[in-house]
């Protein structure tokens, strides 16, 4: 093949080599960029900056080599458009530092930085950690900091990510309240901070205030949906990023739903209960407290991490006709009570009998003196027969 006269020449099926002295000062408009998996650049003393726009359109790039060139600065977001990058060789350039953000999100198997006039400061703590942990082939390079000594010897006691403290209200929060959260950020070299509120959606109206080192967040007119939702404060410095998540508990009264019994391995009377704080529960059967046993018991499904509602079953193991009847679930928390009832028929009565005859079942009555049709409204002093904390 004839020698290639261009600044950059094809190499293999999806590679490009740019080795003609001083031919490049940026990586804009490389030929066939979108299909490149390998890019080799050498002897480009005018190539001093590598920025986000330089690698746009190089989405397939796996290997990038820029060596013996004039590279002085690599932007923190330079490799945003090259998520598949696995080998990065920037040896023998003029790099004094490289931000942790530059390699964040990449799965680099190899990172070569030897031959650069690196300058040791907390900004290279991440690289020192790579060296300590044997990542990316860094230990073999025995990196030196210009004028100082081996990167491995850099003191790092003061090289911490920011420390965050989020203050949440102590008092109970009710639906409709406004809540002020404050995130206190401490640490050296603070660069950026903010809130992540992606989980909130319609849970409240959000107003941000303040800035480093004290960020304010007002959640106005909160709804019960705010429960179990993460409100996250984050901050970054030259060492790395820290995040702290908190949840605001919004009090609301108990609610309950019952569904038609379904036959599974055991029979199940499905229910859903909600409330903050988590309500205590008790079951009634035909108006009397149902004492749970190994044959009839409450079972909860695994709760969803981001909601207060709990789903479960009243499990009945091989119920017979004596278990046919009216099932009521009572739920109560300090902010209110609720109940729901359902008729369940598991099996026809195999015996002929007079419907007026009593059925011998060992249930204790709830309140023999009460004639109230709605047990939820009763102000009886009887303790719940079954108390289950939900949440």
């Amino acid at each position: 093949a004839a020698p290639c006269p261009d600044a950059c020449c094809p190499h293999g099926s999806s590679g490009l080599r740019c080795t003609r002295d001083g031919a490049l000062d940026s990586l804009h408009h490389l030929p066939g960029a979108e299909n490149l998996t390998e890019l080799y650049i050498e002897n480009q003393q005018h190539l001093q900056h590598l920025e986000l726009r330089d690698l746009r359109g190089l989405g397939e790039l796996r290997n990038l080599t820029i060596v013996k060139s004039g590279l002085r600065f690599v932007a923190p977001d330079a490799f945003h458009f090259t998520p598949r990058l696995s080998r990065l060789n920037l040896s023998f350039n003029a790099l004094e530092s490289l931000s942790w953000k530059t390699v964040q999100g990449l799965s680099l198997q190899e990172l070569v930085l030897s031959g650069n006039p690196l300058h040791c400061s907390c900004a290279l703590r991440w690289l020192q950690r790579w060296e300590e942990e044997g990542l990316g082939g860094v230990p073999e390079q025995k990196l030196q900091c210009h004028g100082q000594g081996p990167l491995a010897h850099m003191p790092n006691a003061s090289c911490g990510v920011p420390t965050l403290k989020v203050q949440v209200p102590n008092a109970s929060v009710d639906v409709g309240d406004d809540v002020l959260l404050r995130c206190q950020v401490e640490g050296r070299g603070l660069e950026q901070a903010g809130w992540i509120l992606t989980e909130l959606e319609q849970s409240a109206t959000v107003m941000k205030s303040g800035g480093l080192p004290s960020l304010g967040l007002t959640l106005a007119n909160v709804t019960s949906d705010l429960n179990r939702k993460n409100v996250t404060c984050w901050a970054e410095n030259d060492v790395g990023r820290a995040e702290v998540s908190v949840q605001v508990n919004v009090s609301f009264p108990a609610s309950v739903q019952l569904h038609t019994a379904v036959e599974m391995h055991h029979w199940c009377i499905p229910f859903s209960v909600d409330g903050q704080p988590a309500p205590s529960l008790r079951w009634l059967f035909n108006g009397s407290v149902l004492n749970e046993t190994s044959f009839i018991f409450t079972e909860f499904l695994e709760p969803a991490a981001n909601e207060t509602v709990r789903h479960g079953c009243l499990r009945l193991n091989q119920p017979t006709h004596v278990n046919n009847g009216n099932y009521t679930l009572l739920a109560a928390n300090p902010f209110g009570q609720a109940s729901a009832s359902i008729m369940a028929a598991f099996m026809d009565n195999p015996f002929e009998f007079n419907p007026e005859d009593p059925i011998p079942v060992s249930f204790s009555p709830v309140d023999t003196n009460s004639t109230s049709g709605d047990p939820v409204e009763k102000k009886d002093e009887t303790p719940f027969g079954v108390s289950v904390a939900v949440g």
Partner: antibody
């Protein structure tokens, strides 16, 4: 013990050059970066540049770029700082100092060399 | 370059006094160094990376601080402590020194 011994005082005319030596003893000369710092009369300390005797890598303060040359002779464990195109404001005491990476600081200093630039 | 500003530039104190010298960096730095210099002598390292005493430095000297604000404290001034004190950063090139604080006998 670790010692840095510098050459004697110099008087130079403006436009001339001066070469100050710094002889190291008591440690492996090629392992530690050697720095040069100066102090004008009654003034503070000013960093000039550094050399790694192991491979002659150098760095300089922008202010001295092109006017200062740092060299070393590993056979005699001596570092040299040459400053050219001297001006009166280069009158100062010039120090060599070792950067001790085990504890990460300038631990040993030469006694200083007074350079006077006067017509 | 990162500027280092020392205050005060000079102070008069008596033997036994507690003396505090501050050093402020123009931007956040990783760690700080302090040197003591007596007339006609080379600087002597006093404190390295912010709070660690150099070898042979008496415990009456202490360093603290983070970010941009740092302090050198002499808990009980002794006759041999009358000197000029310099702070120095090396968070980024070039290393820079403060203007110095001269501690004189009252």
């Amino acid at each position: 013990q670790v010692q840095l011994v510098q050459s004697g005082a110099e008087v130079k005319k403006p436009g001339a050059s001066v070469k100050v030596s710094c002889k190291a003893s008591g440690y492996t000369f090629t392992t530690y970066w050697m720095h040069w710092v100066r102090q004008a009369p009654g003034q503070g300390l000013e960093w000039i540049g550094t050399i790694y005797p192991g491979n002659s890598d150098t760095s300089f303060a922008q202010k001295f770029q092109g006017r200062v040359t740092l060299t070393r002779d590993t056979s005699t464990s001596t570092a040299y700082m040459e400053l050219s195109s001297l001006r009166s404001e280069d009158t100062a005491v010039y120090y060599c100092t070792r950067f001790y990476f085990e504890d990460w600081y300038f631990d040993v200093w030469g006694q200083g060399t007074t350079v006077t630039v006067s017509s | 370059d990162i500027q280092m500003t020392q205050s005060p530039s000079s102070l008069s104190a008596s033997v036994g006094d507690r003396v505090t010298i501050t050093c402020r960096a123009s931007s956040s730095i990783s760690w700080l160094y302090w040197f003591q210099q007596k007339p006609g002598k080379a600087p002597k390292p006093l404190i390295y990376y912010t709070s660690t005493l150099g070898s042979g430095v008496p415990s009456r000297f202490s360093g603290s601080g983070s970010g941009t604000d740092y302090t050198l404290t002499i808990s009980s001034l002794q006759p041999e402590d009358f000197a000029t004190y310099y702070c120095q950063q090396w968070h980024s090139y070039p290393p820079t020194f403060g203007g110095g604080t001269k501690v004189e006998i009252k």
